[in-house]
């Protein structure tokens, strides 16, 4: 079941999925001046069996000005620098992607990929939040949102991360720890 909505936006924070549940789709979007190859996939799909998950289909982009198809290659370093996603690019890794059964890793970039990735998440997907540069977490604890099915409708849980400006004074006891910790995360609540 696809999640109806995008994960919540919260002030001064960005989110990232550390692994993608089977059923997740990633649109094959190309950067300006490029388009999907004819008969190319519309999206990549995370699929798998009990032991292994991977992305089906390959995204391929070609110049809008030519009819030649481009081959699937890893971008050069300068291309990778330019690329960003809807979620943050961050070294934060609260879970080992490879160790989660039924999940795919972040797909590698494809040549002339759009600067923003558009994912279609499924129920049970978890995303992690982190404060943007210049802000810090007001508390120590998990900072995540999970797509859940409740009353026959999908919804994302409310992230518990509050990001405060460095200049702001707050009653924060002790040193900050990384907020995207996998342990002690809010557990599932009863849905109807």
């Amino acid at each position: 079941e696809l999640c109806d909505d995008d994960p919540p936006e919260i002030p001064h924070a960005t989110f990232k999925a550390m692994a993608y549940k089977e059923g997740t789709m990633l649109n094959c979007e190309c950067k300006r001046g490029f388009r999907r190859i004819k008969s190319g996939s519309l999206y990549m799909l995370c699929t798998g069996n009990s032991s292994h998950s991977s992305w089906d289909n390959q995204c391929q982009c070609t110049s809008s000005a030519t009819r030649n198809t481009t081959k699937q290659v890893t971008p050069q370093p300068e291309e990778q620098k330019e690329r960003k996603t809807t979620e943050m690019q961050s070294p934060m890794q609260p879970v080992d992607q490879a160790s989660l059964p039924g999940h795919c890793r972040e797909p590698p970039p494809w040549e002339n990929e759009a600067t923003e990735r558009i994912y279609h998440f499924v129920v049970g997907q978890m995303v992690y939040y982190q404060c943007v540069q210049g802000y810090r977490a007001l508390h120590r604890g998990p900072a995540e949102s999970v797509c859940k099915m409740t009353h026959g409708k999908t919804r994302w849980t409310q992230p518990q991360l509050i990001c405060t400006g460095e200049m702001e004074t707050s009653q924060f006891p002790g040193e900050e720890k990384p907020q995207a910790s996998p342990e002690g995360r809010p557990e599932s609540e009863t849905s109807c």
Epitope: H12, L138, R140, G184, T190
Partner: antibody, heavy 116, light 107 residues
């Protein structure tokens, strides 16, 4: 299911101290912010402040900073709102709610009456 | 500080009416807005968050729209259970601000 249960109504005299409580159940209390909201008789809602029981991080509305103290004891899944010296103007209904941004779950409210 | 202004303060309507409540922010607040319903002697109940996302279990006759400074809560067909006071609420990383409320009463 998620529940927030507040302590009972209180009648106090001006100058007295008071501590009211909000006990959470049905979820991991330590991992969710709890806010306190005031509603004076016949008036609207006012956000007072918020606490993260996991580490007792707090944030107060400027209007209530120094007037009240928000605390929590995660070992018994309870958040508190306290006054060291009550005034007649503190007469109101006080709600706790689970946040931090919007409030999906609310306590039933604690009516505090301060009168000489 | 951001000020949230609700209008009208009181609205008289009949069962079956389409009702629109307005909430204005003194400066842009993106979509960081929630709506609540409160009945006398009861705690508020969350209806809408993120300006337009319906909370689980809330009837689909309720809908929210708007972004920036102007927001609306619409009840497509007013039911007897809907006569109550409605509050908008802005949230950000350092405070929460409620509007003054709109009371929806029976005409």
């Amino acid at each position: 299911q998620v529940q927030l249960v507040q302590s009972g109504a209180e009648v106090k005299k001006p100058g007295e101290s008071l501590k009211i409580s909000c006990k959470g159940s049905g979820y991991s209390f330590s991992n969710y912010w709890i806010a306190w909201v005031r509603q004076m008789p016949g008036k609207g809602l006012e956000w007072m402040g918020i606490i993260y029981p996991g580490d007792s991080a707090t944030r107060y509305s400027p209007s209530f900073q120094g007037q009240v103290t928000i605390s929590a004891d995660k070992s018994i899944n309870t958040a508190y709102l306290q006054w060291s010296s009550l005034r007649a103007s503190d007469t109101a209904m006080y709600y706790c709610a689970r946040g931090p941004y919007y409030f999906e779950y609310w306590g039933q409210g604690t009516l505090v009456t301060v009168s000489s | 500080d951001i000020v949230m202004t609700q209008s009208p303060s009181t609205l008289s309507a009949s069962v079956g009416d389409r009702v629109t409540l307005t909430c204005r922010a003194s400066q842009s607040i993106s979509s960081y807005l929630a709506w609540y319903q409160q009945k006398p002697g009861k705690a508020p109940k969350l209806l809408i968050y993120k300006a337009s996302t319906l909370e689980s279990g809330v009837p689909s006759r309720f809908s929210g729209s708007g972004s920036g400074t102007e927001f609306t809560l619409t009840i497509s067909s007013l039911q007897p259970d809907d006569f109550a006071t409605y509050y908008c609420q802005h949230y950000n990383s350092y405070s929460v601000t409620f509007g003054g409320g709109t009371k929806v009463e029976i005409k």
